[in-house]
C-alpha cells in the first residue's frame, strides 16, 4: 500500500513510529536520479552543500549516496493492533557526516552535518513503487514526500485521494 496519509487520524502515526534498532539492517551505496533520469548532485559551496537536479553530460560521473535502511514499527492508529506492521525507513548521506534533512517549515530538503543519533528529520519512510522506483516520505510529516520542484529537491504534500501526476516524487536508485 502506498499508504499516503492525507487523513487526519493518520498524522500521528509516523511521529509515534519508533526505529526498532539504532543500527541499520543494511546499507546501500547508490546514485539517485529522478523518474525522468535527471541526476541528483551535491556541490560544496561556501562551506555548505547544495543539492541540484540536473542532466549530466555523457561521461560525467554520478554522485553517490549512502542509504541506510532501518526497520520501523508503524503503529496503527486505526486498528490499535499493529496490523500495519513494520515499514522500512531510510537515511541518505552523500558524504561523511552529512545527511539529507526535511525542513518542513521551509518545505525544503537540506544537507545538514550532524552526529548520531540522527534527528527524526533525517529519516524517511521508504515506499517501494513500480517501474523500479522508490519514494521518500518524511517521518516527521506524514503525506509529505521528497520531490522535484524547479530543478531542486523540495518537500511536496501528497494526498492519496487526489488524482495527481506523481512522477515528481519517484526516484531511481542505481549502483552505476
Amino acid at each position: 500500500a502506498f499508504g499516503i496519509s492525507g487523513v487526519q487520524k493518520y498524522t500521528r502515526a509516523l511521529h509515534d513510529s519508533s526505529i526498532t534498532g539504532i543500527s541499520p539492517i543494511t546499507e546501500y551505496l547508490a546514485s539517485l536520479s529522478t523518474y525522468n533520469d535527471q541526476s541528483i548532485t551535491f556541490a560544496l559551496e561556501d562551506e555548505s552543500y547544495e543539492i541540484y537536479v540536473e542532466d549530466l553530460k555523457k561521461d560525467e560521473k554520478k554522485d553517490k549516496v549512502l542509504l541506510s535502511y532501518y526497520e520501523s514499527q508503524h503503529p496503527s492508529n486505526e486498528s490499535g493492533d499493529g496490523v500495519d506492521g513494520k515499514m522500512l525507513m531510510v537515511t541518505l548521506s552523500p558524504t561523511k557526516d552529512f545527511w539529507l534533512h526535511a525542513n518542513n517549515k521551509e518545505h525544503s530538503v537540506e544537507l545538514h552535518k550532524c552526529e548520531k543519533p540522527l534527528p527524526d528529520q533525517a529519516f524517511f519512510v521508504l515506499h517501494n513503487m513500480h517501474s523500479n522506483c522508490v519514494s521518500f516520505e518524511c517521518k516527521t510529516d506524514p503525506g509529505v514526500f521528497i520531490g522535484v520542484k524547479d530543478n531542486h529537491l523540495a518537500l511536496i504534500k501528497v494526498d492519496s485521494s487526489e488524482n495527481l501526476c506523481t512522477e515528481n516524487i519517484l526516484f531511481k536508485l542505481s549502483e552505476t
Epitope: 500500500a1 502506498f2 499516503i4 493518520y10 539492517i25 543494511t26 515499514m87 492519496s160
Partner: antibody, heavy 121, light 111 residues
Framework: EVQLVESGGGLVQPGGSLRLSCAAS????????MNWVRQAPGKGLEWMAE??????????HYAESVKGRFTISRDDSKNTVYLQMNSLRAEDTAVYYC????????????WGQGTLVTVSS | DIVMTQSPDSLAVSLGERATINCRAS??????????LNWYQQKPGQPPKLLIF???SQGSGVPDRFSGSGSGTDFTLTISSLQAEDVAVYYC?????????FGQGTKVEIK
C-alpha cells in the same frame, strides 16, 4: 478491527463470468494497494492481480494466466475492491483471497478468509 | 517470470528441534540493496500470515524462533525450536518483479 471480507464466489460453468467483491473495514481503504491471490484445492498460492491508488491513476497489474480475462477494480467510496472474472476455465477453480499490501508496499499483511470459485459443467 | 523453488517439499521435525526450509529464485531478487523475498505461514483452513520480509526482517508479532537469511537467489527460513503450533505450510515469495511469484510450499510436520 481491520478486516477484508470476500463474497461472490460459487459454481459457474466453463466460459461463464463471476464478479468477486471484497469489503474492507477498520482502515483507510483509499490509502492501500490491494491484491487478489488464489489457491487451487490442495495447491499453493498464486498471485493474480494488483490495483494501486487514485493517486497512482489506479494502475493495475496481472498474472499472465488471467491477463485479458480478469479485471481488478476498486470503489474507494464503498471501501471495496472487485475481481471481474470472464471466460472462466476449470483451472480457475480455487479459493480467492483479497489481500492488502502494507504501508510502503513491501509485503501483504492483511488477508481475507477467501471465497471459493468452482468452474465446472 | 521469476520461478521460486522450495526444498524440501515436506519436513518432519521433532518438537524443540530446528527446521530449515530453502528457497531458490531463478534469478536474483535483489534490488535497491535489499532482497525482495518474503516468507508466509499458512495453517489449514486459514489465509497466509507474513513471517519475514526483505529476506531477514521479522513481521510484527512473529516469534523470535522464526528467522530468515540469504540474498540474491538463495534464501533460508529457520525455525530454531519447533513448536506444535508451527505445523503449517510455508511459502517463499518474491516481490521484486511482477508477477509476484510464490514457491510451491513446504509442509512442516511433527516427527
Amino acid at each position: 478491527e481491520v478486516q477484508l471480507v470476500e463474497s461472490g464466489g460459487g459454481l459457474v460453468q466453463p466460459g461463464g463470468s463471476l464478479r468477486l467483491s471484497c469489503a474492507a473495514s477498520g482502515f483507510t481503504f483509499s490509502n492501500y494497494w490491494m491484491n487478489w491471490v488464489r489457491q487451487a484445492p490442495g495447491k499453493g498460492l498464486e498471485w493474480m492481480a494488483e490495483i494501486t491508488l487514485k493517486f497512482n491513476s489506479y494502475s493495475t497489474h496481472y498474472a499472465e494466466s488471467v491477463k485479458g480475462r480478469f479485471t481488478i477494480s476498486r470503489d474507494d467510496s464503498k471501501n471495496t475492491v472487485y475481481l471481474q472474472m470472464n471466460s472462466l476455465r476449470a483451472e480457475d477453480t480455487a479459493v480467492y483471497y483479497c489481500a492488502r499490501r502494507n504501508y510502503g508496499n513491501w509485503y501483504i499483511n492483511v488477508w481475507g478468509q477467501g471465497t471459493l470459485v468452482t468452474v465446472s459443467s | 517470470d521469476i520461478v521460486m523453488t522450495q526444498s524440501p517439499d515436506s519436513l518432519a521435525v521433532s518438537l524443540g528441534e530446528r527446521a530449515t526450509i530453502n528457497c531458490r529464485a531463478s534469478e536474483s531478487v535483489d534490488k535497491f540493496g535489499m532482497s525482495f523475498l518474503n516468507w508466509y505461514q499458512q495453517k489449514p483452513g486459514q489465509p497466509p500470515k507474513l513471517l519475514i520480509f526483505v529476506a531477514s526482517s521479522q513481521g510484527s508479532g512473529v516469534p523470535d524462533r522464526f528467522s530468515g537469511s540469504g540474498s540474491g537467489t538463495d534464501f533460508t527460513l529457520t525455525i530454531s525450536s519447533l513448536q506444535a503450533e508451527d505445523v503449517a505450510v510455508y511459502y517463499c515469495q518474491q516481490s521484486k518483479d511482477i508477477p509476484y511469484t510464490f514457491g510451491q510450499g513446504t509442509k512442516v510436520e511433527i516427527k
